[in-house]
Amino acid sequence: LLVSQGVLLKCQKGSCSNATQYEDTGDLKVNNGTRRNISNKDLCASRSADQTVLCQSEWLKYQGKCYWFSNEMKSWSDSYVYCLERKSHLLIIHDQLEMAFIQKNLRQLNYVWIGLNFTSLKMTWTWVDGSPIDSKIFFIKGPAKENSCAAIKESKIFSETCSSVFKWICQY
């Protein structure tokens, strides 16, 4: 699954005021071969202004965002779709403070998928909102090639094969 097929999320100041801000993600290939069409407008539909956001049941709130930690395991692309279907997206980490919050709430020591994969088109690690990773802020250990997706474990970010099955984190 190449996230570079479309920009996933374009919310300004946490609101979804103007339909022209959204680009369609187009058809997303899912592992079982079915296809779904999900627009970015849908992703933003339930997101309030950052400071007044209300998180759904079982979601944790931090700095105006909501986080959901899975208990089951899926591949990166299945995790990606799971979050989209719940009007959210795989976790985008903006800074080390947010990373610390995630670590504090990860009860397990295993790998957990985040919304970051290596796009062979751009030859860079790219978040699911289309933005490239800032290597001054984040370091990823492991191969940087096609079918590389990022997972976190403890305080580290690892490159793993996208078809591996791990827990994951959704965010909106």
Epitope: F118, S135, F138, K141, K145, S155
Partner: antibody, heavy 114, light 111 residues
Framework: SLEESGGRLVKPDETLTITCTVS????????ISWVRQAPGEGLEYIGF?????SAYYATWAKGRFTISRTSATVDLKMTSLTTEDTATYFC??????????????WGQGTLVTV | DIVMTQTPASVSAAAGGTVTINCQAS??????LSWYQQKSGQPPKLLIY???NLESGVPSRFKGSGSGTDFTLTISDLECADGATYYC?????????????FGGGTEVVVK
């Protein structure tokens, strides 16, 4: 294998680029690090280039040293050289371990004299 | 930055004896430490990784131990060929940046 080249005698304040030529190594899977050793002194870590092409440096090396790569070479560019930069410069490849870093394969080094 | 402090700077022991080299990190680095042997005019050679894992082909006389901030390399049944300088290296990294500082080195002289 790894082979360093480009080391030579230079004057203070000059700029020099030395090269690590890799063979049989996929640079999208392994990091390449630069380490130096002044005559009779210990090993000093300079920095490395990650699998995605981003470079990381020891604090003391930031600004004056630049690591870059092509598909088969990793360069170390050194600016404003001083006599303290006189050393043998080694490149080393990490082991590609899933979790741990350690440097398994080393070049023979190239001598830079300022 | 992580600072690696290695002691002693030099140690002398008889063949067949044992030497112990200590390495202390300025902050906890878990088990993310490696040990190298370097002989004159040669590049370093990996001995131990992950604080206690013996690299393939390295004799079991070399033993690494420790975790957190304090680490030890023990060489038993010393042989003349063990005369060299030994370095510890932090291999610590997190989600922000790696720190691969070396210790100052310990010269081992086998009598």
């Amino acid at each position: 294998s790894l082979e360093e080249s480009g080391g030579r005698l230079v004057k203070p304040d000059e700029t020099l680029t030395i090269t690590c030529t890799v063979s049989g190594i996929d640079l999208s899977s392994y990091i390449i690090s630069w380490v130096r050793q002044a005559p009779g002194e210990g090993l000093e870590y300079i920095g490395f280039i990650n699998t995605d092409g981003s470079a990381y440096y020891a604090t003391w090396a930031k600004g004056r040293f630049t690591i870059s790569r092509t598909s088969a070479t990793v360069d170390l560019k050194m600016t404003s050289l001083t006599t303290e930069d006189t050393a043998t410069y080694f490149c080393a490849r990490d082991a590609g371990h899933r979790y741990l870093f350690y440097f398994k394969l080393w070049g023979q080094g190239t001598l830079v004299t300022v | 930055d992580i600072v690696m402090t290695q002691t002693p700077a030099s140690v002398s022991a008889a063949a067949g004896g044992t030497v112990t080299i200590n390495c202390q990190a300025s902050q906890s680095i878990s088990n993310e430490l490696s040990w190298y042997q370097q002989k004159s005019g040669q590049p370093p050679k990996l001995l131990i990784y992950g604080a206690s894992n013996l690299e393939s082909g390295v004799p079991s006389r070399f033993k690494g131990s420790g975790s957190g901030t304090d680490f030890t390399l023990t060489i038993s049944d010393l042989e003349c060929a063990d005369g060299a300088t030994y370095y510890c290296q932090s291999n610590y990294y997190d989600s922000s940046s790696p720190d691969f500082a070396f210790g100052g080195g310990t010269e081992v002289v086998v009598k």
